[in-house]
Interface confidence: low
Amino acid sequence: DPASKSRSCGEVRQIYGAKGFSLSDVPQAEISGEHLRICPQGYTCCTSEMEENLANRSHAELETALRDSSRVLQAMLATQLRSFDDHFQHLLNDSERTLQATFPGAFGELYTQNARAFRDLYSELRLYYRGANLHLEETLAEFWARLLERLFKQLHPQLLLPDDYLDCLGKQAEALRPFGEAPRELRLRATRAFVAARSFVQGLGVASDVVRKVAQVPLGPECSRAVMKLVYCAHCLGVPGARPCPDYCRNVLKGCLANQADLDAEWRNLLDSMVLITDKFWGTSGVESVIGSVHTWLAEAINALQDNRDTLTAKVIQGCGNPKVNPQGPGPEEKRRRGKLAPRERPPSGTLEKLVSEAKAQLRDVQDFWISLPGTLCSEKMALSTASDDRCWNGMARGRYLPEVMGDGLANQINNPEVEVDITKPDMTIRQQIMQLKIMTNRLRSAYNGNDVDFQDASDDGSGSGSGDGCLDDLCSRKVSRKSSSSRTPLTHALPGLSEQEGQKTS
């Protein structure tokens, strides 16, 4: 009946016009559909041009929906990153401020004449946390070696101590432990704490980066066809009230987002590793305890040096010979100031606990983000049928959708009835992002064991002996340059989106 056919085109006119397209494209009454390339070729209210316009629009709408979902996740990760980064930086800044406020009174010139060395140490710890390509153990070793030379000179102003004597002092120091247990303790605890903190924050950065990059992956032409058929073909075929069958929608989106679903395994691994490493934030070697109390180890070290001064001097003279007396120099420094130690255990502020529990909950919520995308988009962005199964749009007509729902990921789309997916051609951007996830997971797993992956096996003799615990007192027998207190490699592992001098971002 021509009248009913022309009536059905009225609804298409309404939808088509609402999308901003010209109504002059829309036929007054249904026409034969041999020209249709995507929709089934029955009687239709859509011309070729309309079909093409609607296909492009449905494609754009799906990409927008995909970006919206990704943006929510990205925002969550970015917020987490900022919160943790602020907290960790705050801990270190607090420690440095305490040092600057208390050390002049506690140690007098022993501190004031070496303030630059302490400042440089904090700068290097900050750089390391932010991802600089520093070897933390070496950084600490060089700090102690430099400090020992300078303090020894200050404690013995009456002696002439040329460079070769100071080199000998450095070699003796390993056995003498002039700073007591503090350097070793600080090294062991700081390495684990800083590695854990920086890898966790880097993990958040990488996760956010992956989401951003994957959201930009274009949907292929086969997906466009399938989404057009899913969303608008019912209108073209005169069944505009029929909503898509849920399983039909899922199959279309599983086909369209097949590559994205392949992120699932490595995404879960990354989030698991991130949740796991938060275990390293607590206890005496935990992030909060260690980063916030670096100054107490430094105070302990200077006190130990002063306490051991006479024994140390005797042993150094034994090993290195009698140094010449400086005729211009004053007598030996007798006034000793002993720095009163602040309690090493910082009372937990509760901030980190709150941050971690929130992060754990949110990371758990987004674990299945990639495989749940088809379901999420179908249920949230599509007006799916809730009517009985045989009344929904199945891609051909109103009726039951019979094919089974495909599994997740590229390999499972081999028989997807809705989207022709070439399972032999994975998307390269997504493969690269899978690799980034894998790489970051490796870093976190190493960090969990207290290792910094960038410096595993980086021993000077090239013997591949692990992360190396060879120095008894963090003072290995090495010459230390007295020229510069901070000749460091620039950032090469910067955290994404954090520092002004970012170096090279992880991608």
Partner: antibody
Framework: AVTLDESGGGLQTPGGTLSLVCKAS????????MFWVRQAPGKGLEFVAG????????LYGSAVKGRASISRDNGQSTVRLQLNNLRAEDTGTYYC????????WGCGAYSAGDIDAWGHGTEVTVS | ALTQPSSVSANPGETVKITCSGG???????YGWYQQKSPGSAPVTVI????KRPTDIPSRFSGALSGSTATLTITGVQVEDEAVYYC??????????FGAGTTLTV
Amino acid sequence: AVTLDESGGGLQTPGGTLSLVCKASGFDFSSVNMFWVRQAPGKGLEFVAGIDNDATFTLYGSAVKGRASISRDNGQSTVRLQLNNLRAEDTGTYYCAKTLCSTTWGCGAYSAGDIDAWGHGTEVTVS
Amino acid sequence: ALTQPSSVSANPGETVKITCSGGGSSGYGYYGWYQQKSPGSAPVTVIYNNNKRPTDIPSRFSGALSGSTATLTITGVQVEDEAVYYCGSRDNTYVGIFGAGTTLTV
């Protein structure tokens, strides 16, 4: 001691298929990434293909992309390179190389900067 | 490709530095240095992962990475160090790349 033994080289015909095998011993094969690198006569080193420890990722140099396939058998400690549609410019010495870093506790990169041991090479002539 | 000088020369006992730049910029910059004494002979790794040295390589060979430039340093170069040195890294798509080689003449 680490040993990497390449085999399968020799005279090949243009348009044909090359199949090289590298047999590894002296280290935990299943924990490391493996690469094939080649060197044309009088030229420098060129990355051909790479595969990670559990064969999750395979990587190919631009000159062989679409023609090469790298695979590994961790049970046999072998890595294989297949190169189809051979050309004269595929002539050269093909080296098998291992990296020290496993992907489980990795050094964080899939890089020709990771190579810590090389095979002696197998010569391939396409003519 | 990676950029390295085509040749350097030195007298025995001198210190030689060879630079290499242009590796992948994602922040995981790893460089290796490979010595080849004659064409067709197998390369030998002298440095991998920027600064690691295989156990059988003399301590006069060292590596460092500063920014995105890797440097191979041979302190007290010897006649037997004469060779072509290739640096290796990767591009931004993770594909391995090598420099064209630096001929060291002692």
